[in-house]
């Protein structure tokens, strides 16, 4: 989806464990720590020397909804995400570097602690470089590792 164009289940045992309020997670990982604004995320990334992962999405976008579910249920992604400063946005920031090839959703962009947008860490779609689909979780996981690995080699 291009945001410039338009913007009752029974519980199973594992659902009974206490969940944190969704607020900032918006369902992308209720057990993770999420930042509220891009500015805060940049500050935390710089001061903690951890890469930032920015997820752009929309509540009313089927592909955002679908990616959110697999992201939140993917144990390895959720574990690896603990090593990032995390931000999910349902609006566009004024920083054009976060939309290198357009303002579509869902898209995931990595920023390193030097505040450089990692435009080189891309998905598999040539027309939407930072888009991921539910079938792309392995690639997303690898890209997260790449962001962490490259960060370590740059220290």
């Amino acid at each position: 989806k291009d945001t410039t164009v338009k913007s009752g289940a029974k519980k199973d045992p594992k659902d009974s464990r206490p969940k944190l309020p969704q607020t900032l997670s918006r369902g992308w990982g209720d057990q993770l720590i999420w930042t509220q604004t891009y500015e805060e995320a940049l500050y935390r990334s710089k001061t903690s020397n951890r890469p930032l992962m920015v997820i752009h999405h929309l509540d009313e976008c089927p592909h955002s909804q679908a990616l959110k579910k697999v992201f939140a249920e993917h144990k390895e992604i959720q574990k690896l995400a603990e090593q990032f400063v995390l931000l999910n946005l349902v609006y566009e920031t004024t920083d054009k570097h976060l939309s290198p090839d357009g303002q579509y959703v869902p898209r995931i962009v990595f920023v390193d602690p030097s505040l450089t947008v990692r435009a080189d860490i891309t998905g598999r779609y040539s027309n939407r470089l930072y888009a991921y689909e539910p079938s792309d979780t392995a690639l997303l996981y690898d890209n997260m590792k790449k962001a962490l690995k490259l960060l370590k080699t740059e220290l």
Epitope: K1, A9, D15, P62, H63, N127, P134
Partner: antibody
Framework: QVQLVQSGAEVKKPGASVKVSCKTS????????MNWVRQAPGQGLEWIGW????????NYNGKFKDRVTLTADKSTSTVYMELSSLRSEDTAVYFC?????????????WGQGTLVTVSS | DIQMTQSPSSLSASVGDRVTITCKAS??????LSWFQQKPGKAPKTLIY???RLVDGVPSRFSGSGSGQDFTLTISSLQPEDIATYYC?????????FGGGTKVEIK
């Protein structure tokens, strides 16, 4: 193999409600979206809405939003579509259709359909 | 809502013919388009998703192409069992919307 088995035909009076079930097997129930689609006699296909059985999240076609409720029962791997305030124009075959196996939105497998007739 | 305009609404072709059905979206839907085959009294069957990906078990004579607003379903060599109505579906945006259908008959 994947199977979606729907409940039998229903005849309802105008103003009544109907609840159609779709019992699934052969895949991880909680991790695929389930869509509902209807087809009036001799007409095309119309999307009603979808539900994620894992947590019950739904999205409805605005045309049906006030009258339709989708639910899921993980203990029986069954999804339900309830349509209220029935009118004659709701006479149609109602299909459940599973999303992609990996959680993708595309419709992959279809139930056999349930004919709902609304008549006084 | 996104409108899906399918054409032709019906066609008649001979066994072995190449058959092409088109679907046009009222706005860009990327590649989020599926094609379905429906025979009388039966549930639809999914043939293609993401514009050009063939569903497992579907004969290779079926293919899909296109992106953005214009999409095509091609049957390279029409077989008697292909007699059915074909529908496209956009799933880029809520509500998902179907084309009006194309009825394929044998000459």
């Amino acid at each position: 193999q994947v199977q979606l088995v729907q409940s039998g035909a229903e005849v309802k009076k105008p103003g009544a409600s109907v609840k159609v079930s779709c019992k699934t097997s052969g895949y991880v129930f909680s991790r695929s979206w389930m869509n509902w689609v209807r087809q009036a006699p001799g007409q095309g296909l119309e999307w009603i809405g979808w539900i994620y059985p894992g947590d019950g999240d739904t999205n409805y076609n605005g045309k049906f939003k006030d009258r339709v409720t989708l639910t899921a029962d993980k203990s029986t791997s069954t999804v339900y579509m309830e349509l209220s305030s029935l009118r004659s124009e709701d006479t149609a075959v109602y299909f459940c259709a599973r999303g992609g196996y990996d959680g993708s939105p595309w419709l992959s497998y279809w139930g056999q359909g349930t004919l709902v007739t609304v008549s006084s | 809502d996104i409108q899906m305009t399918q054409s032709p609404s019906s066609l008649s072709a001979s066994v072995g013919d190449r058959v092409t059905i088109t679907c046009k979206a009222s706005q860009d839907i990327n590649s989020y388009l599926s094609w379905f085959q429906q025979k009388p009294g039966k549930a639809p069957k999914t043939l293609i998703y993401r514009a050009n990906r063939l569903v497992d078990g579907v004969p290779s004579r079926f293919s899909g192409s296109g992106s953005g607003q214009d999409f095509t379903l091609t049957i390279s060599s029409l077989q008697p069992e292909d007699i059915a109505t074909y529908y496209c579906l956009q799933y880029d945006e809520f509500p998902f919307t179907f084309g009006g259908g194309t009825k394929v008959e044998i000459k």
